[in-house]
């Protein structure tokens, strides 16, 4: 048994780190492998993560962690029974992938405006809470040529779009993702998309 692609891990800077890797051949990850992890810290214990399959040769493990602080460093050992396949380390604060925003809602009852709101995925006491900026992707299922990214660089998780900039009488979808500039994170996954119908019509005298 051999590791083809070494584990690569990202932290949500809250309670979970996710490690993914590829094996040299088809593997039943949960039955054959264990990822052991231990915080480099006085009297810390070794904890075990049972991986899941992620495609034929891919494995993924969700490591339960405490709140992340910059000093935290973990040792990682990938075992197949009594055989040590790989040994490495992981500093969560240096490999952050934020959680995806949630509760994306479209409000169309605001005059002349489509208002999109979503929730910050972190509690106020988390360091990322006040550091997230967002990208909102809006596209149309009726008009494949229409797809826009709106960068939201302010803290408030909202975006206002003049309804007149969207075609009337067709459906649109939106999704949102986040990143934290000061923590040099990657982008989060996209939130689930939400759909709405743009029924806005310009007043008669503006036509």
């Amino acid at each position: 048994m051999k590791v083809l692609q070494e584990p690569a891990c990202v932290s949500d800077y809250m309670s979970i780190s996710t490690c993914e890797w590829k094996m040299g051949g088809p593997t039943n990850c949960s039955a054959e492998l264990r990822l052991l992890y231990q915080l480099v810290f006085q009297s810390s214990e070794t904890h075990t993560c049972v991986p899941e399959n992620n495609g034929g040769v891919g494995c993924v493990c969700h490591l339960l962690m405490d709140d992340v602080v910059s000093m935290d460093n973990y040792t990682l050992d990938l075992w197949a029974g009594q055989q040590l396949l790989w040994k490495g380390s992981f500093k969560p604060s240096e490999h952050v992938k934020p959680r995806a925003p949630g509760n994306l809602t479209v409000h169309t009852n605001v005059s002349d405006t489509v208002l999109l709101t979503w929730s910050n995925p972190y509690p106020p006491d988390n360091y990322l809470y006040n550091d997230l900026t967002y990208a909102v992707n809006i596209w149309s299922e009726n008009d494949p040529a229409y797809s826009r990214i709106h960068n939201v660089t302010y803290l408030k998780p909202t975006l206002r779009i003049p309804a007149s900039t969207l075609k009337s009488g067709i459906s649109y979808r939106a999704r949102v993702r986040a990143w934290a500039q000061h923590y040099n994170t990657t982008w989060s996954e996209w939130s689930p998309s939400t759909k709405w119908y743009n029924s806005y019509r310009e007043p008669f005298e503006q036509r």
Partner: antibody
Framework: EVQLVESGGGLEQPGGSLRLSCAGS????????MTWVRQAPGKGLEWVSS????????YYADSVKGRFTISRDNSKNTLYLQMNSLRAEDTAVYYC??????????????????WGQGTTVTVSS | DIVMTQSPLSLPVTPGEPASISCTAS???????????VDWYLQKSGQSPQLLIY???NRATGVPDRFSGSGSGTDFTLKISRVEAEDVGFYYC?????????FGQGTKLEIK
């Protein structure tokens, strides 16, 4: 009531051995790391050894490494210190102390908040 | 190893007066914001040490509020706002960030 009671001290000749015990009660013993601290006559406090809650992690002062072994039996709520190749400079009162919660991912620390009454070890010919 | 240096080593105090003991570490004991791995212990004559302050500034259960701890990084202070006769004994700072845990030399507090 949370309590630690040491035993096993006594007079031993240089090169001899002693085994100290520390019985814990009133708390979930296996959840906590434990520590031994000693105090030579008229001197300050000196850390000797620590062990994680599971017993997998053990730590020693350079002065006792290779001679002393810390261990625990969580089924008996008891901590041990096996002392071999004793020297005159090991003469001290030995205290066991309750250390951090080690079952969490990052051990939670609240100080060495409970100490035993101490057991005296005298190494002399 | 982290060296803990205490001062003064002897501290005569009049009852009712404040007292202050300093402890300096040879390297930072700050692990993360608010978590300085330094404790203060009091050992009264013929007794086991007892915990006063943990993680720099947290008072242990049952410790009178006249005791307080402060500082961050390498410099720490234990303050007694009004010394009482029962406070006599040896005071030790200790770092537990990493093994070996190390203690200060001890400060003997006595009543004038």
């Amino acid at each position: 009531e949370v309590q630690l009671v040491e035993s096993g001290g006594g007079l031993e000749q240089p090169g001899g051995s002693l085994r100290l015990s520390c019985a814990g009660s009133g708390f979930t013993f296996r959840d906590f790391a434990m520590t031994w601290v000693r105090q030579a006559p008229g001197k300050g406090l000196e850390w000797v050894s620590s062990i994680s809650g599971s017993g997998d992690g053990t730590y020693y002062a350079d002065s006792v490494k290779g001679r002393f072994t810390i261990s625990r039996d969580n089924s008996k709520n008891t901590l041990y210190l096996q002392m071999n190749s004793l020297r005159a400079e090991d003469t001290a009162v030995y205290y066991c102390a309750k250390d951090r919660v080690s079952i969490t991912i990052r051990p939670r620390y609240y100080g060495l908040d409970v100490w035993g009454q101490g057991t005296t070890v005298t190494v002399s010919s | 190893d982290i060296v803990m240096t205490q001062s003064p080593l002897s501290l005569p105090v009049t009852p009712g007066e404040p007292a202050s003991i300093s402890c300096t570490a040879s390297q930072s004991l700050l692990y993360s914001i608010g978590y300085n791995y330094v404790d203060w212990y009091l050992q009264k004559s013929g007794q086991s040490p007892q915990l006063l302050i943990y993680l720099g500034n947290n008072r242990a259960t049952g410790v009178p509020d006249r005791f307080s701890g402060s500082g961050s990084g390498t410099d720490f202070t234990l303050k007694i706002s009004r010394v009482e006769a029962e406070d006599v004994g040896f005071y030790y700072c200790m770092q537990s960030l990493q093994t070996p845990y190390t203690f200060g030399q001890g400060t003997k507090l006595e009543i004038k």
